[in-house]
Amino acid sequence: IPVIEPSVPELVVKPGATVTLRCVGNGSVEWDGPPSPHWTLYSDGSSSILSTNNATFQNTGTYRCTEPGDPLGGSAAIHLYVKDPARPWNVLAQEVVVFEDQDALLPCLLTDPVLEAGVSLVRVRGRPLMRHTNYSFSPWHGFTIHRAKFIQSQDYQCSALMGGRKVMSISIRLKVQKVIPGPPALTLVPAELVRIRGEAAQIVCSASSVDVNFDVFLQHNNTKLAIPQQSDFHNNRYQKVLTLNLDQVDFQHAGNYSCVASNVQGKHSTSMFFRVVES
């Protein structure tokens, strides 16, 4: 298992400070940390040194050292705080994408551990969080919104109390994607149809999904029909409906009708047969 020097879990320095982190292992070692400026890397066999002579708030983060050749996959970590009185937050990403019911980590890292008691999460322009937003905070990692919901796809800011006033981070956009279990659900009504020539008929092709991104079409034999689509949203599902109205059916209307819907997960189709008789 590699060992990091300094041998502390946390290191707090001022902006402009010189910081040296050394990792020693049995074999070659590698550093991984937040993308930040001013670091110089020196490697020498089983040791590797990360060094900066001008630490900035952007160097705040967890630096992990691993030994790629270690079969046990051991690692060591140190968290660096560069406590800049003007910059309480180091935001590592401005867009976070998760699926519904996953935890969403908003990576705003506190640059000074002393400020932890006065942190909060808000939506941009100071708007409060949506009701039932369950979140926690870690100064090393940021805010975690637990079991994120689609409706929580918003722009957020991290807030810290400094000298009695709230200082905000830059905004972080959270995109919560619906978990699409499979292709859209389909209904084709009626299941079968017989009409006398000259009568009216109606065929309804309906598809629904938790996500709006899907296509639906009705085809007669092998011809895709151009039918206006009606869209709706209820019971947390998006619905798209195609209604074919025939005022006076004729023999050319007879045949196989297929309702087809597709999304990123695949395609569903269902068919019915329409018979037209003389009398």
Epitope: I1, E5, S7, V8, P9, L11, V13, A17, T20
Partner: antibody
């Protein structure tokens, strides 16, 4: 409020054994690195042993003077750290402090006294 | 192992004076130095970490400086509560050795 409370000190004969305990509260113990430091008039403050967090594989480190004789361990479910001391010598006499490491030895217990004497 | 040499071993000063305690490491410790204060019969308390950073709640009359192998702790305008012993300690790897201490006494 961070609190560290040592126990288990006392009088022991040379060659004997003793186990010190430290009960912690007021912080997330499982994330913490914990150390033992001892103090005597002859040796001053002397670092003894360290055990790191689970994230750091519960790695242990020892002062050369105690290596092979002392064992540091922890029970995260009980928020406790222990120091098992075997083959004790008169020079192991002193006040043993339990400390939490963050940016330094941020928090110290009140200490427990070990006397090794015949 | 890194040795820490602290000086002076003792110091007799009056309230209101300024004192400086120094600590020398046997090799470069890259500013990974802590200072502790210990009052009679009490546990040590962290004063300074990473050579120059004051621990939470430490009065601003205390200041740490230094780099490489040479470090110092300065106390401006000594108060009566500042009397006691002071220790330096490095965090550049293990073993984490302490300095021998400086006893600050009232003149």
């Amino acid at each position: 409020e961070v609190k560290l409370e040592e126990s288990g000190g006392g009088l022991v004969q040379p060659g004997g054994s003793m186990k010190l305990s430290c009960a912690a509260s007021g912080f997330t113990f499982s994330d913490a690195w914990m150390d033992w430091v001892r103090q005597s008039p002859e040796m001053g403050l002397e670092w003894v042993a360290e055990i790191r967090s689970k994230a750091n594989n519960h790695a242990t480190f020892y002062a050369e003077s105690v290596k092979g004789r002392f064992t540091i361990s922890r029970d995260d479910s009980k928020s406790s750290v222990y120091l098992q001391m075997n083959s004790l010598r008169p020079e192991d006499t002193g006040i043993y402090y339990c400390t939490r490491v963050k940016v330094g030895f941020d928090n110290w217990g009140q200490g427990t006294t070990l006397t090794v004497s015949s | 192992d890194i040795q820490m040499t602290q000086s002076p071993a003792s110091l007799s000063v009056s309230v209101g004076e300024t004192v400086t305690i120094t600590c020398r490491a046997s090799e470069n410790i890259y500013s990974n130095l802590a200072w502790y204060q210990q009052k009679q019969g009490k546990s040590p308390q962290l004063l300074v970490h990473a050579a120059t950073n004051l621990a939470d709640g430490v009065p601003s009359r205390f200041s740490g400086s230094g780099s490489g192998t040479q470090y110092s702790l300065k106390i401006n305008s000594l108060q009566s509560e500042d009397f006691g012993s002071y220790y330096c300690q490095h965090f550049w790897g293990t073993p984490r050795t302490f300095g021998g201490g400086t006893k600050l006494e009232i003149k």
